[in-house]
């Protein structure tokens, strides 16, 4: 039976450019976490596996950074970022848990400040 | 440049253990995991299991996991992959593979050992 | 485990031909699928991979996509030296696996 939770940051927001923390916590469960997979939508991020170490995706290669721990670091963000991940924690002897984050994007404070105050 | 350098075809009998080496050279070595692959003649390809070269920890295809053991060498950059109470069905080409960088796939192979359970 | 089910498993074309072999996982394997060729008495060499990137020095005839469970790898102009077999293979969860292979011969 399956007696563990997901606890995620839920719902977040993060400025253009800036960097993000995708942190999952798996508790209430004594099973083994052998591997954790990182995913958007219909693509995957990252995984990390227990024993063999990270998989980084090659479209996130250059602005996804291990960790910390089985969590993710998504860095230089757009807009286009903004949506559903997916961390789904792969456990012996349970199965199965998935977590969701939904990520926000915003254009900078110092944009949207820019676009309204505009000088003459 | 990456090269992977097996050792040479091994004769066992039933029951028997053998002991497989993969040489690496032209990266460095604990920074990337090796993996081994068999291949039965005729058939497909079926994953054995990889090797962490920085810790030692290990990943197996339960299939194998009570009888293969997958160890290195840091110090002459070498993998080594033993399958023991060896089968007639256990007769395969045996590779060793290294992934991408952080990545899993299959980017280097070594030409590959071809081991013959034989009584 | 998951099951990499392989179509078809061997295939006749024509040089020139566009040729087309799918792949389905038996459950959700996201983008973590790679293709690999290989030619007889040869080790496996990788193509294509998450799934649709081409690996360093791979001819811009071999593309691939999906996601989820099903996937295509496709060969735009058949040449001679594509005469092989090609194998598809997940590493979204251990065990890794491979499909059964599509032996591609010239009519």
């Known amino acids: 039976m399956m007696t563990g939770t997901i606890e995620t940051t839920g719902n977040i927001s993060a400025e253009k450019g800036g960097s993000i923390i995708l942190q999952c916590h798996l508790s209430s469960t004594t099973a083994q976490v052998t591997q954790v997979n990182w995913e958007q939508q219909d693509q995957l991020l990252a995984i990390c596996n227990a024993d063999l170490g990270w998989h980084i995706s090659p479209s996130f290669k250059d602005r996804v950074a291990p960790g910390p721990g089985l969590g993710l670091t998504l860095q230089s963000l757009t807009v286009n970022d903004t949506g559903e991940y997916f961390c789904i924690y792969h456990t012996y002897p349970d199965g199965t848990y998935t977590g969701r984050i939904f990520l926000e994007v915003l254009e900078s404070s110092v944009a949207e400040h820019g676009a309204r105050f505009q000088i003459p | 440049q990456v090269q992977l350098v097996q050792s040479g075809a091994e004769v066992k009998k039933p029951g028997a253990s053998v002991k497989l080496s993969c040489k690496a050279s032209?990266?460095?070595?604990?920074?990337?995991?090796i993996y081994w692959v068999r291949q039965a003649p005729g058939q497909g390809l079926e994953w054995i299991g990889g090797?962490?070269?920085?810790?030692?920890?290990?990943n197996f295809n339960e299939n194998f996991k009570s009888r293969a053991t997958l160890t290195v060498d840091k110090s002459s950059s070498t993998a080594y992959m033993e399958l023991s109470r060896l089968r007639s069905d256990d007769t395969a080409v045996y590779f060793c593979?290294?992934?991408?960088?952080?990545?899993?796939?299959?980017?280097?192979w070594g030409q590959g050992t071809t081991v013959t359970v034989s009584s | 485990d998951i099951q990499m089910t392989q179509s078809p498993s061997s295939l006749s074309a024509s040089v020139g031909d566009r040729v087309t072999i799918t792949c389905k996982a038996s459950?959700?394997?996201?983008?973590?699928v790679a293709w690999y060729q290989q030619k007889p008495g040869k080790a496996p060499k990788l193509l294509i991979y998450?799934?649709?990137y081409r690996y360093t020095g791979v001819p811009s005839r071999f593309s691939g996509s999906g996601s989820g469970t099903d996937f295509t790898f496709t060969i735009s102009s058949l040449q001679p030296e594509d005469i092989a077999t090609y194998y598809c293979?997940?590493?979204?969860?251990?065990?890794?696996?491979f499909g059964g292979g599509t032996k591609l011969e010239i009519k």
């Open positions: 593979t290294r992934g991408n960088y952080y990545g899993y796939e299959f980017a280097y």
């Open positions: 293979q997940q590493h979204y969860s251990t065990p890794w696996t």
């Open positions: 032209g990266y460095t070595f604990i920074s990337y995991n």
């Open positions: 998450s799934p649709s």
């Open positions: 090797v962490n070269p920085s810790n030692g920890n290990t």
């Open positions: 459950q959700h394997v996201s983008t973590a």
